[in-house]
């Protein structure tokens, strides 16, 4: 028989983690493995048909994606949709596929809304999702005794698909669910310095534990301004939500592992400011299969797609598409063995959910709602050399924090700052006021 996989991803623009130039080679590698393994879909041929989720400008589109999906549905009647990755493109496609009762498999669509499976039935996320970041942060807060207040700042950049809005939304909602905690959130425009000034005025009244989603440059600017304003001392901690670790990469940008460094005359101050910073990224898989997969992926991307893949965490997305597709094919194989058909979307999907799988990204667990358990890394500065290193990983499956470094985190005080100031944000603690009065008497 024939099994058709309908792909709805950016076909021209290579900048997205889920661009076809990146995911295509991963799909090829997965299908080559299916052919090579007699236990997977014996006697079946798997073919891919392509539709673009981008508009004429190469930008993800909530119009182009569903139109492409509809065309693919009526023309090819696919058994499964692969993608989209962009939130606004995936939303309408996911609603259509739910209505058609056709499984949708993606390693993108990380926003909180896709976890609502009555709306996005049969949507399986084999990649990371933002609510899972909230699980990590909640675990971190519990261990550090931060159970009262946090502040989340997110940058707005025109044309960036509101990545930071969705990231902070997932984080905010999950942290509030997991902990009885007050969380404030503020948006700022990356290109408007007056916004930064306003944030710095608000910060002291709103939080000591601060999460920031922004570009590496915006985060550095904020840290420099915070240092200038005296907010980078021992009382504050700033977490940069840099999930793909852009700030930790070399190349054109900052030196590897030195996100404060630019060679612009402000490095000394920036290094000092970054003493109060930690960085949260996805965890880089460290299993040998992943390294081998990356070698093959890069080779194939160059040979067949004329695309040079850079190193970095962004490659976990094509790898997750690869693993997700293999998991789907495993589920189809089992469904057929039990007398089902490739069009039995519900049955196939149920076999993918609440399931573990050993893939190129390592041990992969899809939870009971069809979302992958996600691993994260916490990076911290080594005060000796100013380089950031992974000090802690979060295992999404076991929901445990794993000590990676043998050395403790770099807290200026030697211990984590409290999440609310000693006397409260507005000096409202009566004990502090009492002390103050007694000195006046």
């Amino acid at each position: 028989g024939n099994l058709t996989v309908a792909v709805v991803l950016p076909l021209a623009n290579t900048s997205y983690p889920w661009s076809w130039a990146r995911v295509g080679p991963a799909v090829e590698l997965a299908l080559a493995q299916v052919k090579a393994r007699p236990d997977l879909l014996p006697g079946w041929t798997v073919r891919t048909v392509l539709g673009s989720s981008e508009n004429a400008l190469g930008v993800c589109s909530d119009t182009a994606a569903p139109l492409a999906a509809v065309d693919l549905k009526w023309e090819h009647n696919p058994a499964v949709f692969l993608g989209p990755g962009c939130v606004y493109a995936a939303a309408p496609v996911g609603r259509f596929t739910a209505h058609w009762r056709v499984p949708l498999l993606t390693a993108g669509a990380p926003a909180l809304g896709f976890g609502v499976k009555d709306e996005y039935a049969l949507t399986t996320r084999a990649g990371p999702s933002y609510a899972k970041l909230g699980d990590f942060v909640a675990a971190l807060h519990r261990r550090l005794g931060w159970e009262r207040q946090a502040l989340m700042l997110y940058a707005y950049r025109p044309g960036d698909e509101e990545h930071c809005f969705f990231l902070v939304e997932g984080l905010f909602m999950r942290v509030r669910d997991r902990l009885n905690i007050t969380v404030d959130h503020l948006e700022f425009a990356e290109d408007d310095l007056s916004h930064y000034t306003r944030l710095l005025r608000t910060m002291p009244r709103k939080g000591r534990v601060i999460y920031i989603c922004s570009s590496p440059d915006a985060f550095r600017t904020l840290m420099l301004l915070a240092l200038e304003a005296g907010l980078c001392g021992e009382d504050y901690v700033f977490f940069h939500l840099d999930i793909f670790g852009q700030s930790l990469q070399g190349g054109q940008g900052p030196a590897p592992r030195r996100p404060w460094e630019r060679g612009d005359g402000q490095d000394v101050s920036a290094r000092q400011a970054f003493q109060a910073a930690k960085i949260i990224t996805y965890k880089d898989p460290d299993n040998p299969e992943y390294l081998e997969f990356l070698k093959q992926l890069k080779h194939l991307a160059y040979e067949q797609f004329n695309f040079t893949m850079e190193d970095g965490l962004v490659n976990t997305i094509p790898a997750s598409f690869h693993d997700g597709l293999l998991l789907y094919i495993q589920a189809v194989t089992e469904t057929l063995a039990h007398g089902g058909t490739v069009t039995d979307g519900e049955n196939i999907t149920q076999r993918m959910w609440n399931r573990s799988f050993q893939g190129v990204t390592g041990y992969l667990k899809i939870d009971s709602s069809g979302d992958r358990e996600t691993d994260f890394s916490l990076w911290d500065m080594d005060p000796e050399n100013g380089a950031f290193r992974v000090v802690l990983n979060y295992n999404g499956t076991s929901q445990e924090l794993v000590a990676v470094s043998g050395r403790k985190l770099n807290w200026p005080l030697g211990y984590p700052p409290p999440d609310i100031p000693k006397c409260g944000f507005d000096n409202e603690d009566p004990a502090c006021n009492q002390d103050h009065l007694s000195t006046l008497e």
Epitope: A403, G406, L409, P416
Partner: antibody, heavy 120, light 107 residues
Framework: EVQLVESGGGLVQPGGSLRLSCAAS????????MGWVRQAPGKGLEWVSS????????YYADPVKGRFTISRDNSKNTLYLQMNSLRAEDTAAYYC?????????????WGQGTLVTVSS | AIQMTQSPSSLSASVGDRVTITCRSS??????FGWYQQKPGKAPKLLIY???RLQSGVPSRFSGSGSGTDFTLTINNLQPEDFATYYC?????????FGPGTKVDIK
């Protein structure tokens, strides 16, 4: 309640080997750096070795480097110390300790100790 | 390796006294430093971490101060259960090193 229980100590001849174990319970084992601290009879405390929760980082004191190997089995919540080429000066009570890299609590939990005697 | 020196090596005091023990490191260790109490036949117990933070459950008569190379443990209103040996420890860098200890006994 946190518990650390050491075992495996005993009398061994110089040049011999011994493997100490520490069974941990009452906390998230992988979240902590674990280590060994020893104390020779009537003497002070000496840090011996530490290992990270991910098993990727191990550290040793100079006197034991190349002779002792620290390891852990996170699935069994157990810490080990393989001691080879033992010398008389390794005679001591060996304590299993926790080190919380997140909060900065250094060696806040200790086992009751297991005595290693190296003598002919 | 960083050397830790402790003084005095022993002292005699009475119940109710104020006792001060000092520890000096051979190089700057910020506040990556702790104090331990050990009683005969028992495992040591953490009193102070990060140079001045009182470990949970430790009486407030114990206090720590210092940063860099010089550190102090102070016991106010010495109690009978405080007669023990006290050790300092640096966890600034591996290898971690303890001080030689200070024995506090009854005058």
């Amino acid at each position: 309640e946190v518990q650390l229980v050491e075992s495996g100590g005993g009398l061994v001849q110089p040049g011999g080997s011994l493997r100490l174990s520490c069974a941990a319970s009452g906390f998230s084992f992988v979240s902590y750096v674990m280590g060994w601290v020893r104390q020779a009879p009537g003497k002070g405390l000496e840090w011996v070795s530490s290992i990270s929760g991910s098993l990727t980082n191990t550290y040793y004191a100079d006197p034991v480097k190349g002779r002792f190997t620290i390891s852990r089995d996170n699935s069994k919540n157990t810490l080990y110390l393989q001691m080879n080429s033992l010398r008389a000066e390794d005679t001591a009570a060996y304590y299993c300790v926790t080190y919380d890299i997140l909060t900065g609590h250094l060696f806040d939990y200790w086992g009751q100790g297991t005595l290693v005697t190296v003598s002919s | 390796a960083i050397q830790m020196t402790q003084s005095p090596s022993s002292l005699s005091a009475s119940v109710g006294d104020r006792v001060t023990i000092t520890c000096r490191s051979s190089q700057g260790i910020r506040n990556d430093f702790g104090w331990y109490q050990q009683k005969p036949g028992k495992a040591p117990k953490l009193l102070i971490y990060a140079a001045s933070r009182l470990q949970s459950g430790v009486p407030s008569r114990f206090s720590g101060s210092g940063s860099g190379t010089d550190f102090t443990l102070t016991i106010n209103n010495l109690q009978p259960e405080d007669f023990a040996t006290y050790y300092c420890l640096q966890d600034y860098t591996y290898p971690f090193t303890f001080g030689p200890g200070t024995k506090v006994d009854i005058k």
